[in-house]
Amino acid sequence: ALDTNYCFSSTEKNCCVRQLYIDFRKDLGWKWIHEPKGYHANFCLGPCPYIWSLDTQYSKVLALYNQHNPGASAAPCCVPQALEPLPIVYYVGRKPKVEQLSNMIVRSCKCS
Amino acid sequence: ALDTNYCFSSTEKNCCVRQLYIDFRKDLGWKWIHEPKGYHANFCLGPCPYIWSLDTQYSKVLALYNQHNPGASAAPCCVPQALEPLPIVYYVGRKPKVEQLSNMIVRSCKCS
């Protein structure tokens, strides 16, 4: 799987999950989240050569098409597969609230 | 929805489904499919600005991050959302067979 275990410990050039830290205030302009100040969101990057963790029958056909038509703009793209939630603390008035923000952290990628 | 109804009738520059015809023999090197000779597979293409048919909470965060960090390589990507099957006819010996190939045609796209 193109997950953090594999991708963070290798020099993989193809589609893989990459490290990305997002600071809520600096990067998103969000002041309302009290904790954490930021988080390891990660992101997906890298080419999707034939056959690299392809998602569907369509992506296999498209990758094959791309190999035979290298100049084509139609190609599979490296996108998140498994996402995890992020617990945050924010305030409503003076009252702290704990919330799970779903689908916030990328754990693995796929070619779609 | 970024589907064929909308995308094929507009000059949309952002993520949208685009027309792509694949000829089985010329583009894939497949001689074994008797009918059809090719099909309208379509593909997804275009930038994913904030907020353009974003898939998950993560893709919203990433698009926002991208707005604040325009030079970053981390950005959502335009990929298939709804896929449809393709019926084909091929031969096993002299006997024609009809098969539905699943997930072969892109009907709509999303930013993931």
Epitope: Q57, K60, L64, H68 | R25, L28, G29, W30, K31, W32, Y90, V92, K97, E99, L101, S102
Partner: nanobody, 114 residues
Amino acid sequence: QVQLVESGGGLVQPGGSLRLSCAASGSIFGVFYMGWFRQAPGKQREMVAISTDDRTSYVDSVKGRFTISRDNAKNTLALQMNSLKPEDTAVYFCNLNQLGTDYWGPGTQVTVSS
């Protein structure tokens, strides 16, 4: 059900050659592609070469050194590997995609070392 069996792997010196073969048995029809893939220790499985009915494709690192060939009458696939390098060391797998379903052989080890 399709079965695949590879043969021809072994130990070879840098610059040497090997020929891998793959025999396919079962009901072979509706073949999207047949191909050779390899997996080095701690790496993802990667494509080496694939063949459709009248087309072949190679990963950049083997172009000009490896040749894939297919005999449809005998349901066999071969990979001629010349000018082998230490970085070609891996387990090599034969693959057949039939109507969208992937079938794999058990693999054959290729080691390039002096």
